[in-house]
Amino acid sequence: ALDTNYCFRNLEENCCVRPLYIDFRQDLGWKWVHEPKGYYANFCSGPCPYLRSADTTHSTVLGLYNTLNPEASASPCCVPQDLEPLTILYYVGRTPKVEQLSNMVVKSCKCS
Amino acid sequence: ALDTNYCFRNLEENCCVRPLYIDFRQDLGWKWVHEPKGYYANFCSGPCPYLRSADTTHSTVLGLYNTLNPEASASPCCVPQDLEPLTILYYVGRTPKVEQLSNMVVKSCKCS
């Protein structure tokens, strides 16, 4: 699987999950999130050659098409597959609130 | 929606579905498909700015991150959303077979 266990341990050029730390204030301009100050959102990148963790028949066909026709601009793209939530602390007035934001952390990628 | 109805009628730079005709023999090297000779598989391409048909909270956050930090390499990618099947005719020996291949035609795209 193109997940953090594999991708973070290997120098992989092809589609894989990459580490990306986002600082809420500096990178997003968010002051409203009290904790954490930031988090590893991660992202997916890298080429999607034929048979590379293809999502659908279309992405497999497109991967084959691109491999056989490398001058073509059409190719599958490396995108998130499994995502996890992030728990944050914020305030409404002076009242602290704990919320779980869904689909915030990329754990693995696929070619779509 | 970033679908064929809109995208094929407009010169759209951002994420949209694009027409792509694939000839089974010439483009894929497939001799086994008897009919059709080819089909419009289509593909998704174009930048994914903030608010552009985002798939998840992560893709919205990443779109915001990329908009505020344009030098960053991390950004959402334009990928298929809705796909349709394709019916093909092929032969097993001299016996004709009709099969519906799922997820072969891209009808719309999203930013993921």
């Epitope: 914020y90 919320e99 934001l101 | -």
Partner: nanobody, 118 residues
Framework: QLQLVESGGGLVQPGGSLRLSCAGS????????MAWSRQAPGKQRELVAL???????AYVDSVKGRFTISRDNTKKTMSLQMNDLKPEDTAVYYC????????????WGQGTQVTVSS
């Protein structure tokens, strides 16, 4: 339920100025990411400018140096100062607010028409 109301649109000559305003109600306005989006006839909506609760802003290339986005969290308002307007700026302009909790949701105003013509 967040409600957004835009104002300030109208007809203006090329090179002229307009100031769009957006008033929000029904939400912790200070938390949301605000944006202006526009839609020209037959086109998809496109992001024009955005501003976060921490006052980080960004603009689409075609309006950089001409448009300025600002917000006032105490008054629950956002503005877009548009200078040196061009015919290609003609569109319906929408105020957009993205709230992130409890789940991400985009709220859209009804839009205000901006027409740049001589």
């Amino acid at each position: 339920q967040l409600q957004l109301v835009e104002s300030g649109g109208g007809l203006v000559q090329p090179g002229g100025s307009l100031r769009l305003s957006c008033a929000g109600s029904g939400i912790a306005f200070s938390r949301v990411t605000m944006a202006w989006s526009r839609q020209a006839p037959g086109k998809q909506r496109e992001l024009v400018a955005l501003i976060t609760d921490g006052n980080r802003s960004a603009y689409v290339d075609s309006v950089k140096g001409r448009f300025t986005i600002s917000r006032d969290n105490t008054k629950k308002t956002m503005s877009l100062q548009m200078n040196d307007l061009k015919p290609e700026d003609t569109a319906v302009y929408y105020c957009v607010a993205t709230d992130w909790v409890p789940t991400r949701r985009d709220y859209w105003g009804q839009g205000t028409q901006v027409t740049v013509s001589s």
